[in-house]
């Protein structure tokens, strides 16, 4: 369960892959598509609002026997839309939803040497947001400290402007 209904902090950032490709969001046919692509130099990176929550995470749910307070995150690239895990389809989708957000919108945040982060599904421990065929997908990872596969590693670049500009 999420400890508090409000996040402990929020930040505005651009999201890129380990190989410095940008994560972009495009409105197509009244729904959002998520792309992983090389950005032209002059093109502005898409912004994502990251909201950080503290959560209790029982050991029975975790791939490595970890319990205790976890740091979780939701990702919102545009107002009222959040990244969500679709575990049945092994896909990552953008859905419009109201608060309280569903569990599928929460991801356990993992740091790898602080240069990169990875996002583990709250609803499916051991499954991470990753890159597959220039799209985001859910990828099962054999749990180890490395979480080493580059396709589940992402970089966050802070955008220093007031959060409200995002919406």
């Amino acid at each position: 369960s999420i400890t508090g209904i409000s996040p402990i902090t929020e930040s505005l950032a651009s999201l890129s892959t380990y190989n410095d490709q940008s994560i972009t969001f495009a409105l197509e046919d009244e729904s959002y598509e998520i792309y992983v692509e090389d950005l032209k130099k002059d093109k502005k990176k898409d912004k994502v609002l990251l909201s950080y929550y503290e959560s209790q995470h029982p050991s029975s749910e975790s791939g490595d026997g970890v319990d205790g307070k976890m740091l979780m995150v939701t990702l919102s690239p545009t107002k009222d839309f959040w990244l969500q895990a679709n575990n049945k389809e092994h896909s990552v989708e953008l859905h419009k939803c109201e608060k309280p957000l569903p569990d599928q919108a929460f991801f356990v945040l993992h740091n790898r040497s602080f240069n990169c982060v990875s996002f583990e599904c709250k609803t499916d421990p051991g499954v991470f947001i990753g890159v597959k065929d220039n799209h985001l997908a859910l990828i099962k990872v054999d749990y180890s400290e490395n979480l080493g596969s580059e396709n589940i590693l992402f970089k966050l670049s802070e955008i220093l402007e007031h959060h409200h500009h995002h919406h």
């Epitope: 902090t9 930040s11 970890v66 602080f114 802070e158």
Partner: antibody, heavy 122, light 107 residues
Framework: QVQLVQSGAEVKKPGASVKVSCKAS????????ISWVRQAPGQGLEWMGW????????NYAQKFQGRVTMTTDTSTNTAYMELRTLNSDDTAVYYC???????????????WGQGTLVTVSS | DIQMTQSPSSVSASVGDRVTITCRAS??????LAWYQQKPGKAPKVLIY???NLESGVPSRFSGSGSGTDFTLTISSLQPEDFATYYC?????????FGGGTKVEIK
Amino acid sequence: QVQLVQSGAEVKKPGASVKVSCKASGYTFTSYGISWVRQAPGQGLEWMGWIRAYNGYTNYAQKFQGRVTMTTDTSTNTAYMELRTLNSDDTAVYYCARDRYSGSFHGNFDYWGQGTLVTVSS
Amino acid sequence: DIQMTQSPSSVSASVGDRVTITCRASQGIFSWLAWYQQKPGKAPKVLIYAASNLESGVPSRFSGSGSGTDFTLTISSLQPEDFATYYCQQANSLPLTFGGGTKVEIK
């Protein structure tokens, strides 16, 4: 309640090694990482490195790489920090500190040990 | 390494005063900043984490604000037990680094 209890003060000669212990209680030891932070007399705080209690994975500050070893003993819920080739600049109080969040290192601490004074003198 | 610059290095104040301490990071650290209070011979005690979150059990006269590179710790009404040294710490990138400290002394 969560407690981190450290070993007693040590006096060492230059070139020697010291091993400081930090015994944890009041929580599931393997769920949280432990960092070590030192403070020279009258000086500020300096992060030395981190160990994940669950599997012994470590991340050391470059300054201490090759001279420090952090370990854990999950049977006794104890973390250890060994510093080798001591010199007078290593005279400091050494603290252990518990990660605020389990599962991954985020650099946030909530509980600290009481500190262990290590004096290096010939 | 990210440099954390705290100011002032010391401040003289009286009980009841409002005290403000600032911390500047050499590069953006999102909101990953903590504030600690340390008294002589004691371990640091967490006051604020993630820039603005009050640690459980810490009096509400302590507050934190800021994001990116500039952060502030405010003590709204200084109490006798608040005379101590205060440190900021960034938790955004390795190695973790601390500010040089601000000593709050009795005027």
